[in-house]
């Protein structure tokens, strides 16, 4: 359920507010609907950087749960093959605040277009 993914993103944003994490993360800020699964996989990979950088058990657990929920939601869509999409490393690097903002945006796209 993508709304549960949103809920975990809200928890992560609440948890990182008191931390200083200056990592930059590969961020897709203009997702084409035909590349949304590829983009989501990049977001999930980069989310693990936040988990590692924070060194916080609550963030680690929430990230872990979010990844499971997102992968379950992706697999329920069936095996989608997307072509011509950007590799994660080709994406723009952004700060955590902008990364999370774009992450919410792509999850909302999955909800809105389902």
């Amino acid at each position: 359920n993508w709304v549960n993914v949103i809920s975990d993103l809200k928890k992560i944003e609440d948890l990182i507010q008191s931390m200083h994490i200056d990592a930059t993360l590969y961020t897709e800020s203009d997702v084409h609907p035909s590349c949304k699964v590829t983009a989501m996989k990049c977001f999930l990979l980069e989310l693990q950087v936040i988990s590692l950088e924070s060194g916080d058990a609550s963030i680690h657990d929430t990230v872990e749960n979010l990844i499971i929920l997102a992968n379950n939601s992706l697999s329920s869509n069936g095996n989608v093959t997307e072509s011509g999409c950007k590799e994660c490393e080709e994406l723009e690097e952004k700060n955590i605040k902008e990364f999370l903002q774009s992450f919410v945006h792509i999850v909302q796209m999955f909800i809105n277009t389902s």
Epitope: W2, V3, E13, D30, Q101, H105, I111, S114
Partner: antibody, heavy 119, light 108 residues
């Protein structure tokens, strides 16, 4: 600075169709944003009507879904609202608005246009 | 009935602090945004996300969230803050946008 401007008839007859257009300037309708219509009956609160993404995806308020159509014209940088089978209860100020990226918000609004349903 | 509930009215003495609240189960998953609307004018976004202010919005406006409640706080209310305030978020399905019923703020 993004600007939105609603246009369309200010008076619609009962059982007719309300048609409005929102012209977007200072930004592209093909951006990552979703675009919405919101209305406000006289002396009452705000009600979301529906939203559109430039690829053509739409979502509508369940209470209005059977009567609403929102469309986009990328060549004119505008989007439109059609509301069919109108009654006096549809009399309201109609706003178009741009949704922010990420958490729910409307970061830019048109000035609004009053549409009265009356014979 | 709205998925977001606001008190219809609130008042504050000039220069004092007021908190306007918005309740709904969906706020456990989504942040709310807040709008100020004065008579005859379009709404203006004052707070979005966790506690973000668009440029031009005074820092006396702040937002917070706990459980199923979102709050808008005005610290040191000014006469020009007298207006209707609306919260906004998504519904429980995540698909639809919803508004609270609005709170009419009077500055005494």
């Amino acid at each position: 600075q993004v600007q939105l401007q609603e246009s369309g008839p200010g008076l619609v007859k009962p059982s007719g169709t309300l048609s409005l257009t929102c012209a977007v300037s200072g930004g592209s309708i093909s951006s990552s944003n979703w675009w919405s219509w919101v209305r406000q009956p006289p002396g009452k609160g705000l009600e979301w009507i529906g939203e559109i993404y430039h690829y053509g995806y739409t979502n509508y308020n369940p209470s209005l879904k059977s009567r609403v159509t929102i469309s986009v014209d990328k060549s004119k940088n505008q989007f439109s609202l059609k509301l069919s089978s109108v009654t006096a209860a549809d009399t309201a100020v109609y706003y178009c608005a741009r949704e922010g990226i990420g958490w729910p918000s409307f970061d830019y609004w048109g000035q609004g246009t009053l549409v009265t349903v009356s014979s | 009935s709205s998925e977001l509930t606001q008190d219809p009215a609130a008042s504050v003495a000039l220069g004092q602090t007021v908190r306007i609240t918005c309740q709904g189960d969906t706020l456990r998953s989504y942040y709310a945004s807040w709008y100020q609307q004065k008579p005859g004018q379009a709404p203006i976004l004052v707070i979005y996300g966790k506690n973000n202010r668009p440029s031009g919005i005074p820092d006396r406006f702040s937002g917070s969230s706990s459980g199923n409640t979102a709050s808008l706080t005005i610290t040191g209310a000014q006469a020009e803050d007298e207006a209707d305030y609306y919260c906004n978020s998504r519904d429980s399905s995540g698909k639809n946008l919803v508004f609270g019923g609005g709170t009419k703020l009077t500055v005494l």
